[in-house]
Amino acid sequence: LVVTPPGPELVLNVSSTFVLTCSGSAPVVWERMSQEPPQEMAKAQDGTFSSVLTLTNLTGLDTGEYFCTHNDSRGLETDERKRLYIFVPDPTVGFLPNDAEELFIFLTEITEITIPCRVTDPQLVVTLHEKKGDVALPVPYDHQRGFSGIFEDRSYICKTTIGDREVDSDAYYVYRLQVSSINVSVNAVQTVVRQGENITLMCIVIGNEVVNFEWTYPRKESGRLVEPVTDFLLDMPYHIRSILHIPSAELEDSGTYTCNVTESVNDHQDEKAINITVVESGYVRLLGEVGTLQFAELHRSRTLQVVFEAYPPPTVLWFKDNRTLGDSSAGEIALSTRNVSETRYVSELTLVRVKVAEAGHYTMRAFHEDAEVQLSFQLQINVPVRVLELSESHPDSGEQTVRCRGRGMPQPNIIWSACRDLKRCPRELPPTLLGNSSEEESQLETNVTYWEEEQEFEVVSTLRLQHVDRPLSVRCTLRNAVGQDTQEVIVVPHSLPF
């Protein structure tokens, strides 16, 4: 099977149209959520089969898995199918909807499960929480699947931030059904430690009376034995834990730690493993890119986010123009650094109702005793354009002039247009654009000034009209990245009285 584009992951724009093609030596078909969407199937002269799936007017709800498979009953040798995952980042869609049965997760053993909360944008940071808790749980997240790990019988929700609003998923309920088979879970106080620090691992088994724990670990293979401690936890019956404690870890202690548990009554056994990394010294690493120029719109709130990895936990400081920032009492600035997994952090600077004065040079610095990293960017405050003045005058030269003045950030573009038939314009007749072309009896002169204190551009444009023989509606439109504004004036011939 050949899929075009090949993926395996695509990020597409909302409202766009996209074409997926799959071809193979036998009839092929596209599948989406176990259904076959409308598609065009064809057979080429060379015997190749193809199917074209056209996705139109994409929304966030089109996010998900797409499969191309062979579509015949001859039962080909290979059960081949190609998987493609499409993201359609859509700020209007929070978490993708789940079927009711996906919200209830039943288990008969302690096993890894997935809480299937998914978002439309692979760049979003998603965190998992107990339903009644604020603390993010250190569980790995896959944007295509959700959070995977070993979960207690509790209720969980996922959270993400889209723009400046926090979005919660539906609640997911995990129920463990008691069975007598042996179930082991292994966790570590930390899976990353510096040399000289301690490694502490815990292996837990619930519901079995007589169990034997056996650990295998890197140090054991070199003949250096560590004696585990068995602890009978007292919160519920038969909650037994083996603790393996390695003081003063060395680089050679990195590797896989396996706990094998056997119970003699039914001769059941289970084992679980965990990887431990011993690093020479701590680290801080930026994840992803943050552009050196960032934008915020005047009077809107803006959150600037930096994602990084660090061990041990770092101190995070934000600076503006080399001055340290802190949460302001007036609530204009909010700083937060969240630990989204054991070594992953998200630091956010939120500017509430942005002011012009908040433009400038921002730096985030994350550091501890072993390492530091800093990230800087310039914040530009975008101001929607507004036309401040549109006036007409009759100089002695006989020509008529119209002057338009406006401001905005980034620099506004100016568009002049005119309409000669006042009765039909602009509803029935589109206005004519005016400019410096030789055909038009008009000339333009535009000056741009940057006002440092207000941090915005002022545009002054003068339109010279050579001879006006009947009333003319002249419109000045200013446009920039964050808006547009228009004013119009009626210009009458010299000979006509007002």
Epitope: V210, L234, M236, I243
Partner: antibody, heavy 119, light 106 residues
């Protein structure tokens, strides 16, 4: 023969502190979780706190959390209950009890020591 | 937290009578209930665990039954040495005692 002997009870003023001890013998102390259970005059039994055999985990009833600390010294075959910020309602006979490994019910108890909190 | 409601709080019976005490949990305790006998000035004594398993040394006139939330403790033929206060305790999730039942002889 399993034996648990409590000591350290007495009269103390509200807000004061007291440290109870429980000396264990007749079994391998480090293999067993231990607990404190109390009985106020004319009232029923009430679980107070427990500690795992290694001392790695402790558990408390809500009304004593932050005020009482359970601990143990496996080398001395002794468990302790440090009681701070004592209140009149903490007046009771305090029993030392042993947890059976795994199932966790209390299988052996001491005779108890009386703690009176009064001004 | 799991609550345990024990009844009656006291009872008076004749030697040889059948005596029944009940304990109800606020949620299922999966048979994790034990029964203790407490006599003044003595250490509490474990009689029965896991609903119906008698401890060694507990006379066979004592028995237990129940499941889910509801449990019963029975003395089939009351003896003078059985005069005491009896307590149930759940150990399914931490520990909660019932209020106790004082057994007296008429």
């Amino acid at each position: 023969e399993v034996q648990l002997v409590e000591s350290g009870g007495g009269l103390v003023q509200p807000g004061g502190s007291l440290r109870l001890s429980c000396a264990a013998s007749g079994f391998t102390f480090s293999n067993y979780g231990m607990a404190w259970v109390r009985q106020a005059p004319g009232k029923g039994l009430e679980w107070v706190a427990s500690i795992t055999n290694s001392g790695g985990n402790t558990y408390y009833r809500d009304s004593v959390k932050g005020r009482f600390t359970i601990s143990r010294d496996n080398a001395k075959n002794t468990q302790y209950l440090q009681m701070n910020s004592l209140r009149a309602e903490d007046t009771a006979v305090y029993f030392c009890a042993r947890h059976t490994p795994g199932a966790n019910y209390f299988d052996y108890w001491g005779q108890g020591t009386m703690v009176t909190v009064s001004s | 937290d799991i609550q345990m409601t024990q009844s009656p709080s006291s009872l008076s019976a004749s030697v040889g009578d059948r005596v029944t005490i009940t304990c109800q949990a606020s949620q299922s305790i999966k048979n994790y209930i034990a029964w203790y006998q407490l006599k003044p000035g003595k250490a509490p004594r474990l009689l029965m665990r896991y609903t119906s398993t008698l401890e060694s040394g507990t006379p066979s006139r004592f028995s237990g039954s129940g499941s889910g939330r509801d449990y019963t403790f029975t003395i089939s033929s009351l003896q003078p040495e059985d005069i005491a206060t009896y307590y149930c305790v759940q150990y399914a999730n931490l520990y909660t005692f019932g209020g106790g039942t004082k057994v007296e002889i008429k």
